[in-house]
Structures are given as C-alpha cells and as structure tokens.
Amino acid sequence: MAVTACQGLGFVVSLIGIAGIIAATCMDQWSTQDLYNNPVTAVFNYQGLWRSCVRESSGFTECRGYFTLLGLPAMLQAVRALMIVGIVLGAIGLLVSIFALKCIRIGSMEDSAKANMTLTSGIMFIVSGLCAIAGVSVFANMLVTNFWMSTANMYTGMGGMVQTVQTRYTFGAALFVGWVAGGLTLIGGVMMCIACRGLAPEETNYKAVSYHASGHSVAYKPGGFKASTGFGSNTKNKKIYDGGARTEDEVQSYPSKHDYV
C-alpha cells in the first residue's frame, strides 16, 4: 500500500512539475523590465525564450518572435535546449511511469518489470528536473550579469546633455515557475526511485519448504538472492518462529509468491 502511494504521489508530483516546466518554457516573462529606481515609463518590456513583448499604458501589447537562430546569444540557445530536453525526458518519463503504476494492470506484467520501469521513469524525472533547474539558473545568471553591466553604464550621454536610459531587466515570473517546477519534477523522480525499492520482488533460487515440527510449527524461509536491482538489504536466511512471527527486517520487505508461512 505504501509503495503504491509513494509511486502514485511521485507520478502526480512529476506530472505537475513537467506541466510547470512546459508552462515556464512557453511563458513570455522570463525577464521583465526593472521598475525599481528607474524613471517611470508608459511602456513595460518583458522577454521570453521565444519572443519579446511590450505592454503600453494604452493597454496595447505587442510581441515579436525571435525569427533568427544564428543571431541569438549562445546562452539563450543553451537555455532553450535544456528546457526542451527537460520536457522531452519528462514526457517520456510520464509515459513510462503510467505503465509502471502498481494500480494499473497491463496483461501479466511482472513486478520486476514494473520496478525497472519505475526506476527508469524516476531517473528520467530527476534528469528532467535538473535540466529545468539548470536552464532557469543559467538564464538567471545571465540576467544578473547584464543587470549589473547596465547599472554600471545606466546613463550614456552625448556630452552630458542628452541622456539615454538603458532598460534593465530583472527576474520574471517564468524563472520562479521553472525553479519550482524543476524541483517538483526532481522530488517526483526521487519518490519513484524510492517506490522502486518496494516494488522489487524477492526472487529465490529454489522453492521455499515448510517444515512442520511436532511441538509448534516452524517455518524455514531461505532468503536466496535478491533481484539484481541492487536495492535489496535482506540477503540473510531468516528463521521465523512462533507461528510465523516476523523479524523487524522482514516486515519491511514485501512477501513474494514463494513465501509459505
């Protein structure tokens, strides 16, 4: 039950995260005109990964796409690439995780296959989240650098008579959406990986045998070898006495189809 909940929650959190990454990538407000300590303009500028926009006091908003690839800064291209990779990985992760969900039955899919799919989707979500966080952070760093550069030469004038105020840009809403969404996708991925541990079945090399003693029943359960997921901690053979009472370690590992107690 706990595994199903962890896996389900991981899926939902990742789904929200990836939706957020998509939203952030499409948003126009990656950088917005800095209004602090600046002359109040009747024009508000903001920019996204794909186009820049101007909202006028009159209520008119005009957006223009970046209709060039080669003319754009390398950093912007890198951010675009990171966000797209994040979305693609996240989308594939979602697709894989749907089939991996414990609550969904697809034919006679083994638990081991579901565990592997859960782990795969978890890793994909983690990488997707990291891509989004990296993309947003690179853009934020670029903004900070440009902000201080434009502050240094805020007023460029002709002999001190005519002044041109340089438009400074600060963090837009998309950056915060991206950071939160990337974090959620990352958390969702970690939850999927944790759920994978519980899904990994206990595979044995031989069938378990029940021994019935005359006094009280004693069941002997060989531990055998774990599936090669590397997540198993229970590698010892355990004896269970007192009519099938389990040790603390064993309560954590879920019974497999070979358990006869």
Epitope: T41, V162, T164
Partner: antibody
C-alpha cells in the same frame, strides 16, 4: 462615433474643491486608458493624470500629486477628476482624453474641455 | 521630468510652401524592446481641442493628409508639411508618450 463630454468646471476660491466629470460614448470605456490634460491661459498643454484601462493603476503629475484624484465608473462610462486644495495655477481648460490602443500611448480623442478658474 | 523643446516658436509661411518644425527631448524616447519611438504630434486650431496627427514619431493617424510627415528617432524629431494649406494654420505640439509624466512642447505657431 467616439465622444468625450466634460462637465463640472467653474469658478472656485483658492483652497476650494471641484469634481470634474467626463462622459464617454462610442467605445468600450472600461478597456481604454484615460487621461486628463489641461491647457493654461498661456496655451501650454500640461498632462494631469492617467488611469490605466482594465488595471486601474493611476499616475499623476508632480504638480497635482496629493491634491487630485483620477477615478472611473465603468458602469456609467464616466471618468472623474476630484480636485482639492485648489491654487491659482490650477486655472486652466481641462480636457478629458483617451489613449489610443494602437497609437503608441498617444491621445487619439479629446473632449471639448471644461474651464476651471481658481480666483479669490 | 522630460523636457520637450520645440523650435521655432512661430513660423510665417505662404500657401504651398514646405514647412519643417523640430522637437527635441531631454531623454531618448526610443524603446529598446520594440525599437519604437514614443513621440506624438498634435495640431490645435483656435477654439478647438488638440487633434492627433502623428504617433510613434512617424505614423500618420487615420484621416490625416499625407502632406504631414513625422520623422526622427531617439531625441530629435521633425514634423514636415510638404505643401502648406490655409487650413493648416494652427499651433503644433509634440508630446513625450514614453515617460511619466507625459510632457508637451511649448508649441510651434504656424501663421500666414
């Protein structure tokens, strides 16, 4: 046809107050940014205040800040300018204007104006 | 506040003549975001409210005769009337539409 009709002007003593009104017709009033502009007896044009369409943000000239309030009633299609602590330098012809939505913040329509005289 | 300086303050012209008037702003009215200039020109005839002629420094408002041309960028702007007609005799104002407070020039009076 777009029409802006101002009213409420008149003679007032220094320190007195006045409320100007502007009834708009022929366009969706609530979505347009509106302004008040005054013309002094010397024929100089001076922007007074602006209220942003939709958002309702307001901007004021430094010379009137704290003494003048711009507001709107979209249900009545009316723009207001509440003036208090009037001074002699507030004597002017007050125009109600509309900022055109594709005119780069330029005022595409003006009313005929209402005259305000501040004198003892 | 942005200072708008218009020159000359008055112009005496004959019908059919070409007229040029200037407007200079103390700060650039060019927006880097869309590379547009936020400057408007208005015409005011006696006893009438101002009428919008040019916006965005160079775009003619609908219904304005094509003899009126706006040009310039940044801080220096010009309004040209290619062939003055009797009905063009008025006061012409330039206005900063970029910074609050919006400011107007003192005007250029066109007279015969």
């Amino acid at each position: 046809e777009v029409m802006l009709v101002e009213s409420g002007g008149g003679l007032v003593k220094p320190g007195g107050s006045l409320k100007l009104s502007c009834v708009a017709s022929g366009f969706t009033f609530s979505s347009y940014t509106m302004s008040w502009v005054r013309q002094t007896p010397e024929k100089r044009l001076e922007w007074v205040a602006t209220i942003i369409g939709g958002y309702g943000n307001t901007y004021y000239s430094d010379s009137v800040k704290g003494r003048i309030t711009i507001s709107r009633d979209s249900a009545k299609n009316t723009l207001y300018l509440q003036m208090i602590s009037l001074r002699s330098e507030d004597t002017a012809l007050y125009y109600c204007t509309r900022l055109g939505q594709t005119q780069r913040n330029a005022m595409d329509y003006w009313g005929q104006g209402t005259s305000v005289t501040v004198s003892s | 506040d942005i200072l708008m300086t218009q020159s000359p303050s008055s112009l005496s012209v004959s019908a059919g003549e070409k007229v040029t008037m200037n407007c200079k702003s103390s700060q650039s009215l060019l927006n880097s975001g869309n590379q547009k200039n936020y400057l408007a020109w208005y015409q005011q005839k006696p006893g009438q409210p101002p009428k919008l002629l040019i916006y965005g420094a160079s775009t003619r408002e609908s219904g304005v005769p094509d003899r009126f041309t706006g040009s310039g960028s940044g801080t220096d702007f010009t309004l040209t009337i290619s062939s003055v007609q009797a009905e063009d005799l008025a006061v012409y104002y330039c206005q900063n539409d970029y910074y609050y407070p919006f400011t107007f020039g003192a005007g250029t009076k066109l007279e015969l």
